[in-house]
């Protein structure tokens, strides 16, 4: 993790890096490694990709252990094959308004992501794309089989932005905060980011937090009850300590994680909050990092890797953050 010890490199000559990822010397000048990319965790030994203008942002001078790969001030963004200047706003589609800031893109929905519970007036609510309309709208199917008594379970309802409006006016400043991005990892420790100007100078800034949707080692499918297809929020039996690049959280946490489905749906955080977590490293250093804590999860078909690159990303975003 730090460069005080002797150089120790893996036996093979050099790792094979994915397309577009630079092969660079680690921060100690010892071994050739695949450079960390925008939003990934970085350390002294695991440097960020210099060819993309990235640096390891440790957050505070006191914490020099683990950072997040961040683009230098003013770095442009590449989104959907188009280059945008830092500070530039653009509509990625009729559904989203986006802003580029120092290499990171934050987007806000232009369409309502409302919810609908069944009622006598709308027993089978469904969101559909109507011809000539950009945003999906609710339709209320009449029962196909009139022998069915009462309402069916509501079709999966897209996550909704609840809580305070992310846009509000404050003394000569239109405060805008994008939703937290989806966690960079589907299991294990990852990073979630957002863009906001909710600060004294009303300047756009990036914020990041650690996130863990579920532990990688958990075999959650075993816990799905017979006859059920999903386990939305599995019960975690014992409190756990989080690990981050060799450092361990000082406190134990009875955290909630998202479950899994056996029918092709994926379960992602829906309501989250952000809390500071202190990590203690082997050398005794303590560092504080903001971390996402899950309140509720939702299981849905808008899974990573769906056709529309941005929509599949958007629908995995975390809503209703309390922090």
């Amino acid at each position: 993790q730090n460069c005080s010890g002797p150089c120790r490199c893996p036996a093979e000559q050099a790792p094979r890096c994915p397309a577009g990822v630079s092969l660079v010397l680690d921060g100690c000048g010892c071994c050739r490694v695949c450079a960390k990319q925008l939003g990934e965790l970085c350390t002294e030994r695991d440097p960020c990709d210099p060819h993309k203008g990235l640096f390891c942002d440790f957050g505070s001078p006191a914490n020099r252990k683990i950072g997040v790969c961040t683009a230098k001030d003013g770095a442009p963004c590449i989104f959907g094959g188009t280059v945008y200047r830092s500070g530039e706003s653009f509509q990625s589609s009729c559904k989203y308004q986006c802003t580029c800031l120092d290499g990171a893109v934050g987007c806000m929905p232009l369409c309502s992501m409302d919810v609908r519970l069944p009622s006598p007036d709308c027993p089978f609510p469904r969101r559909v794309k109507l011809p000539g309309k950009c945003c999906e709208e609710w339709v209320c199917d009449e029962p196909k089989d009139q022998t069915v008594v009462g309402p069916a379970l509501a079709a999966y309802r897209l996550e909704d932005t609840f809580g305070p409006d992310p846009t509000m006016i404050r003394a000569n400043c239109l405060v805008q905060t994008t939703e937290w991005s989806a966690c960079s990892k589907t299991c294990g420790m990852g990073i979630s980011t957002r863009v906001t100007n909710d600060n004294a100078s009303c300047r756009l800034e990036k914020q990041s937090r650690l996130c863990m949707v579920r532990p990688c080692e958990a075999d959650l499918e075993e816990n799905i009850k017979k006859g059920k297809k999903c386990i939305r929020t599995p019960k975690i039996s014992k409190p756990i300590k989080f690990e981050l690049s060799g450092c361990t959280s000082v406190k134990t946490y009875r955290a909630k994680f998202c479950g899994v489905c056996t029918d092709g749906r994926c379960c992602t955080p829906h309501r989250t909050t952000t809390l500071p977590v202190e990590f203690k490293c082997p050398d005794g250093e303590v560092m504080k990092k903001n971390m996402m804590f899950i309140k509720t999860c939702a299981c849905h078909y808008n899974c990573p890797g769906d056709n529309d690159i941005f929509e599949s990303l958007y629908y995995r975003k975390m809503y209703g953050d309390m922090a």
Partner: antibody, heavy 114, light 110 residues
Framework: EVTLKESGPVLVKPTETLTLTCTVS????????VHWIRQPPGKGLEWLGV???????DYNAAFMSRLTISKDTSKSQVVFTMTNMDPVDTATYYC????????WGQGTTVTVSS | ETVVTQEPSLTVSPGGTVTLTCRSS?????????ANWVQQKPGQAFRGLIG???NRAPWTPARFSGSLLGGKAALTLSGVQPEDEAEYYC?????????FGGGTKLTVLG
């Protein structure tokens, strides 16, 4: 963000007509119905009536002859009218969105007194 | 006149499980009654928790579940939290109108 807001007089004289307006935002009245509910001081909730998304209405039988609910979808407003008010009608009046009564207004307290 | 009856008050310890019920005076509650559960915390607005018997609103924690139990609508809270202390109302649909229950005051012991 979904919101509902009731507005109208806080004081009504007996025999007079109460007119309340529920102004909604964050959803369309052509997609969701709106219910009216009241809560007399120290008591429970009483359902009064609903205007459905397509404009049809249903009323509590006890108030059928006194109640009218209408809407102006373009203005996102629902209007609630109750005639022949009596001191026993003193209550906080709420509008709430159809579909699990998920969103409610803050309520408007109406006192019926001469 | 149709009457919907709830327990006036219930007390539970933090971490415990409690079931609130909603009984109809004219027979068993079915899915056709579209049972709704509404919560009001002290000093806060009402908000819907459950609609259509068992469908949770997005803000409703997973520890809340709606069901039909022995001819009644039921709201079960598992692993009760201090913040669950509130007044809970059920509402049942009867073809042309809703009827609210009298409400249950849930107290979570200190």
């Amino acid at each position: 963000e979904v919101t509902l807001k009731e507005s109208g007089p806080v004081l009504v004289k007996p025999t007079e007509t109460l007119t309340l307006t529920c102004t909604v935002s964050g959803f369309s009245l052509s997609t969701f119905g709106v219910h009216w509910i009241r809560q007399p001081p120290g008591k429970g909730l009483e359902w009064l009536g609903v205007i459905w998304r397509r404009g049809g209405t249903d009323y509590n039988a006890a108030f059928m002859s006194r109640l009218t609910i209408s809407k102006d979808t373009s203005k996102s407003q629902v209007v609630f009218t109750m005639t022949n008010m009596d001191p026993v009608d003193t209550a906080t009046y709420y509008c709430a969105r159809d579909g699990g009564f998920d969103y409610w207004g803050q309520g408007t307290t109406v006192t019926v007194s001469s | 006149e149709t009457v919907v009856t709830q327990e006036p008050s219930l007390t539970v310890s933090p971490g415990g499980t409690v079931t609130l019920t909603c009984r109809s005076s004219i027979g068993a509650v079915t899915t056709s009654n579209y049972a709704n559960w509404v919560q009001q915390k002290p000093g806060q607005a009402f908000r819907g928790l459950i609609g259509g018997t068992s469908n949770r609103a997005p803000w409703t924690p997973a520890r809340f579940s709606g069901s039909l139990l022995g001819g009644k609508a039921a709201l079960t809270l598992s692993g009760v939290q201090p913040e669950d202390e509130a007044e809970y109302y059920c509402a049942l649909w009867y073809s042309t109108h809703y009827v609210f229950g009298g409400g249950t005051k849930l107290t979570v012991l200190g």
